[in-house]
């Protein structure tokens, strides 16, 4: 049986044919990149750049490719069978238990600790207190207090644990 | 508080069946995607099968692709795996989980999971 050519496998020049491409389901599932048809029969392929599917699935519909909101960049497209990947901005970060929006990174330390990680699009600047070395986890300092590598920006709540 | 208890698991032959139950304590089970995952001694948890918010449609793995179906039944927030044709490979701790955001239609990853049951422990010896 030869294989199906998914969307993926085309040239970007050949992905605008609207004919959606169709095969038959194994044991009532679909393959990555395709939803299944209201009646079971058929194994239809996801639009590139439109929507997808990751898994073998019974969906009457492939999934809705994500857009990146402003303030992210975009590492890579959603094909058919993978969504887009978005990223934070440089000088922001997504924490994973507030993802909602990617928030600006601390400029510097508050005084009496030292930086001891940088600003990554997943993470805040990490920041230890010189003698113990322990995380900071609590509440920020006043501005003035705050020791900042660039000027103007106040201090962002700290977020990490220690 | 968010909290998941599965049941159901088990010790069974190869070709065997069970059936794992999930019951969720919280008023958003109805309106999220909800998963199953597994974590065998000394591997990574991987996912296992998701299921939308409404029940219509899922995504399973390879390995369990005609084997495993889930179902939800939002009346009782409780989430489901039938297991079938069972292997010694399936052997692991099944967890269930909701996702810690709700713009994915159909998360798939440990990382998109946020909240997690303790798991039910599932053995396929003969």
């Known amino acids: 049986e030869s294989a199906l050519i998914t969307q993926q496998d085309l040239a970007p020049q050949q992905r605008a044919a609207p004919q959606q491409k169709r095969s038959s389901p194994s044991e009532g599932l679909c393959p990555p990149g395709h939803h299944i048809s209201e009646d079971g029969r058929d194994c239809i392929s996801c639009k590139y750049g439109q929507d997808y599917s990751t898994h073998w699935n019974d969906l009457l519909f492939c999934l809705r490719c994500t857009r990146c909101d402003s303030g992210e960049v975009e590492l890579s497209p959603c094909t058919t069978t993978r969504n887009t990947v978005c990223q934070c901005e440089e000088g922001t970060f997504r924490e994973e238990d507030s993802p909602e929006m990617c928030r600006k990174c601390r400029t510097g330390c508050p005084r009496g600790m030292v930086k001891v990680g940088d600003c990554t699009p997943w993470s805040d600047i990490e920041c230890v207190h010189k003698e113990s070395g322990t995380k900071h986890s609590g509440e920020v300092p006043a501005v003035e207090e705050t020791v900042t590598s660039s000027p103007g920006t106040p201090a962002s709540p700290c977020s990490l644990s220690g | 508080e968010v909290q998941l208890l599965e049941s159901g698991g088990g010790e069974v032959q190869p070709g065997g069946s069970l059936r794992l139950s999930c019951a969720a304590s919280v008023s958003t089970f109805g309106t999220s995607p909800v998963g199953w995952f597994r974590q065998a001694p000394g591997k990574e948890r991987e996912f296992v099968s998701a299921?939308?918010?409404?029940?219509?449609?899922?995504y399973y793995a390879e390995s369990v692709k005609g084997r495993f179906t889930i179902s939800r039944d939002n009346a009782k927030n409780t989430l489901y795996l039938q297991m079938s044709s069972l292997r010694a490979e399936d052997t692991a701790v099944y967890y269930c989980?909701?996702?810690?955001?709700?713009?994915?239609?159909?998360?798939?990853?440990?990382?998109?999971?946020?909240?997690w049951g303790q798991g039910t422990l599932v053995t396929v010896k003969p």
């Open positions: 299921i939308r918010w409404d029940g219509v449609g899922a």
């Open positions: 989980a909701l996702p810690r955001r709700g713009d994915s239609e159909l998360p798939s990853t440990v990382k998109e999971y946020g909240y």
